[in-house]
């Protein structure tokens, strides 16, 4: 049987009386054996059955050194079996044998769970040497116990080759519970149950579990260790943790807060950064999520002008990078913008709104009626057009872009030039003769530049062969004419 | 299935005692606590309080201390009222009913009629 | 101690009309549960924490609040829903009941 052996002194119980499924072991009395070291430990063990040989693992020496006759059996003397103490408190515990003189260099070892115990711990074995026999008695002394303490701790000793093997001293480090498990912070929705875990665990077992909701106990009664709570809901933010409670006290997880999911606050700071004729680059800085991550953002863009119908367009974008490049806008016009984001919750409220104006657009239409024509003897082309009919939004006109393109022969040379805007007509030297002259001409405001005109073909001959004859584009701008010298 | 039997009627004189029994069956009678309600004539409910079966610790309601008391017997998973020194205003239909978690009174027993009267 | 008011006392309706009870505690109450209580019977539990329906409730009971206002609504009354009714809070000790609502047919 296993000897058992308790501290004397226990704390209060949290539960007076006895604890329903479970046994009260009364406290054994200590047994007390000198000690030859200045140690003093907390708790002092005897050998239990001095006399008693250990049948287990045995060490049986044939002859003795003269051959003459058998010797007995060796083996480890019983001790306590099993020590029950308090964290932080110290221990010591021994094994004994008496082995016979005619053996040498005799060496204890101790083990713990199956691992031998090397370097730093408190082992200290003693020689009491007789006639015949030398008594060998191994300490084993742990200041401040720990859990990682508990475990089961044997002596061994090698002879002849042989080991011998003590029972095992069971160690039980008793202490408040600890958790393995302790409720997580979340984010629930609204009167939607969820479930919260807590898990202590001893020596001493049980371990019971009190659930506790904003100060208040949920549990009116203790619940055996692991227990789950089944929140029925909540309407609002609340704080739970739980207490474990066992024979040595009471131990509190930490407290969790329990966020209900909303929907988000409105997006703030609205800002442009960028502008042009048809778009209108924005970012803004998101709300709170209201504990739920952000889904998606809407932008929301409303024509500010007494004679729109008041429409508003709306443009989908991801949440994330809070920045969104609003397309498709009316040149050089004023909008109102606001953001609204969303989670699975729901939608916010609509960000202050914010005004913003696109810029100048660029002229939508080409100049009409394009006409070019040699003029051999200045040795330069004429060019004559008309003005393009542009909208307001392209903004005012700021001048003319013609571009001409001289083929001759497989090499192709592009120039441009710029006119003012009160031109309506330019010259261009010549470049190259015996080629073929491309003309096209484009608008330009502050926006910039339009759509080219379709291209007019002139040939420029060699020098001394002349036609006055133009090239020219009819008034709708969308022929190729070619003249052929 | 959970069920909670309650002692028949009693009739008591002035300054007498008694004792109203609440026997629990269909679960661990250890796991929950036992509240304890009257209802006086034609009135509503008033909790008096609840016995903690794990550890025998009674807690009571204001008003209803001194001459209440509340017991068990777990090895029969009966719990216990008793009132002594009764007076006419006791007079009262009492209810024993489990207390499972948020104080949610679960399941009840079918009430004991107590009249007080000389 | 909280206090629990139950509003109005006697709710006088009709079979399939809407019922809304009340409950006002005197400070803020984490859950509300609700009993039904029929003459000459035990309390019978109706609504757990605020809006769970009790095993074999019909879907017709609800209840809904928060802080220190509560409500237990029937939807389209029943003969059999002609009882009265309590609230009970789970925030403080000690335990304590409304003084309930009497809904009686019209």
């Known amino acids: 049987a296993i000897t058992e052996a308790r501290e004397e002194a226990k704390p209060y119980p949290l539960f007076p009386g006895p604890l329903p499924g479970s046994l009260q072991t009364d406290h054994t009395s200590l047994l007390s054996l000198p000690h030859t070291s200045g140690y003093q430990p907390a708790l002092m063990f005897s050998p239990t059955q001095p006399g008693r040989p250990y049948t287990g693992n045995v060490a049986i020496p044939r002859v003795t050194s003269a051959g003459s006759k058998l010797l007995p059996p060796l083996a480890f003397k019983h001790t306590v079996g099993h020590i029950i103490l308090s964290e932080h408190k110290d221990v010591k515990f021994n094994c004994s044998i008496s082995v016979p003189n005619i053996y040498q260099d005799t060496t204890i070892s101790w083990w713990k769970d199956g691992k031998e115990l090397l370097g730093a711990h408190h082992a200290i074995t003693q020689f009491y040497p007789d006639d015949e026999v030398t008594a060998i008695i191994a300490s084993f002394s742990i200041t401040s116990v720990q859990r990682s303490d508990n475990g089961s701790y044997i002596c061994k000793m090698k002879i002849n080759n042989e080991e011998i093997v003590s029972d095992p001293i069971y160690i039980e480090v008793q202490g408040l519970p600890h958790f393995t498990k302790q409720p997580e912070s979340m984010n629930v929705t609204r009167n939607t149950a969820f479930n919260l875990t807590c898990q202590a665990v001893g020596p001493p077992e049980p371990v019971n579990i009190f659930w506790v909701q904003n100060s208040s106990r949920v549990n009116e009664q203790p619940e055996k260790s692991p227990s789950v709570l089944t929140v029925p809901g909540l309407t609002e933010m609340a704080v739970f943790s739980c207490e474990a409670h066992n024979d040595k006290g009471l131990t509190v997880s930490k407290g969790v807060q329990i966020n209900i999911k909303a929907i988000p606050s409105p997006p703030t700071e609205v800002s442009i950064h960028n502008s042009t004729a048809h778009s209108i680059l924005i970012s803004w800085v998101p709300g709170f999520d209201g504990y739920s991550p952000f889904r998606n953002c809407s932008v929301q863009v409303k024509e500010v002008d007494p004679l729109s119908n008041g429409s508003v367009m709306i443009f989908n974008t991801s949440a994330s990078p809070h920045m969104y490049q609003i397309k498709q806008l009316q040149a050089l016009a004023n909008y109102s913008i606001g953001v609204s984001c969303m989670n699975e919750i729901g939608w916010s409220a609509v960000s202050p709104w914010i005004l913003a104006s696109t810029t100048e657009g660029a002229p939508s239409v080409a100049p009409l009626n394009v006409t070019v024509f040699l003029n051999e003897s200045r040795d330069n082309v004429d060019i004559r057009w008309m003005k393009p009919l542009t909208k307001r939004q392209a903004g005012e006109l700021v001048g003319y872009r013609i571009s001409h393109v001289w083929q001759s022969a497989g090499i192709s040379k592009e120039l441009l030039e710029e006119v003012g805007q009160n031109n309506s007509r330019a010259q261009i030297s010549v470049q190259v003769h015996n080629a073929t002259c491309t003309v096209r001409i484009a608008a330009v405001t502050k926006g910039g530049v339009g759509p080219f005109s379709d291209p007019v073909k002139i040939f420029i001959p060699a020098h001394g062969w002349v036609d006055h004859a133009p090239s020219s584009t009819p008034a709708p701008g969308n022929a190729d004419p070619v003249l052929i010298i | 299935q959970v069920q909670l039997v309650q002692s028949g009627s009693e009739l008591k004189k002035p300054g007498a005692s008694v004792k109203v029994s609440c026997k629990a069956s269909g679960y661990t009678f250890t796991n929950y606590g036992v509240h304890w309600v009257r209802q006086a004539p034609g009135q509503g409910l008033e909790w008096m309080g609840w016995?903690?079966?794990?550890?025998?610790?009674?807690t009571y309601a204001q008003g209803f201390t001194g001459r209440f008391v509340f017991s068990l017997d777990t090895s029969v998973s009966t719990a216990y009222l008793q009132i002594s020194s009764l007076k006419a205003e006791d007079t009262a239909v009492y209810y024993c009913?489990?207390?499972?978690?948020?104080?949610?009174?679960?399941?009840w027993g079918q009430g004991t009629l107590v009249t007080v009267s000389s | 101690e909280i206090v629990l008011t139950q509003s109005p006392a006697t709710l006088s309706l009709s079979p399939g009309e809407r019922a809304t009870l009340s409950c006002r505690a005197s400070?803020?109450?984490?859950?509300m549960h609700w009993y039904q209580q029929k003459p000459g019977q035990a309390p019978r539990p109706l609504i757990y924490a605020t809006s769970n329906l009790a095993s074999g409730i019909p879907a017709r009971f609800s209840g809904s609040g928060s802080g220190t206002s509560y409500t237990l609504t029937i939807s389209s009354l029943e003969p059999e829903d002609f009882a009265v009714y309590y609230c009970?809070?789970?925030?403080?000790?000690?335990?304590?009941f409304g003084g309930g609502t009497k809904v009686e047919i019209k």
């Open positions: 016995i903690n079966t794990y550890t025998g610790e009674p």
């Open positions: 009970q809070q789970w925030s403080s000790n000690p335990r304590t």
């Open positions: 009913a489990r207390g499972n978690r948020y104080a949610y009174m679960d399941y």
């Open positions: 400070s803020h109450v984490s859950y």
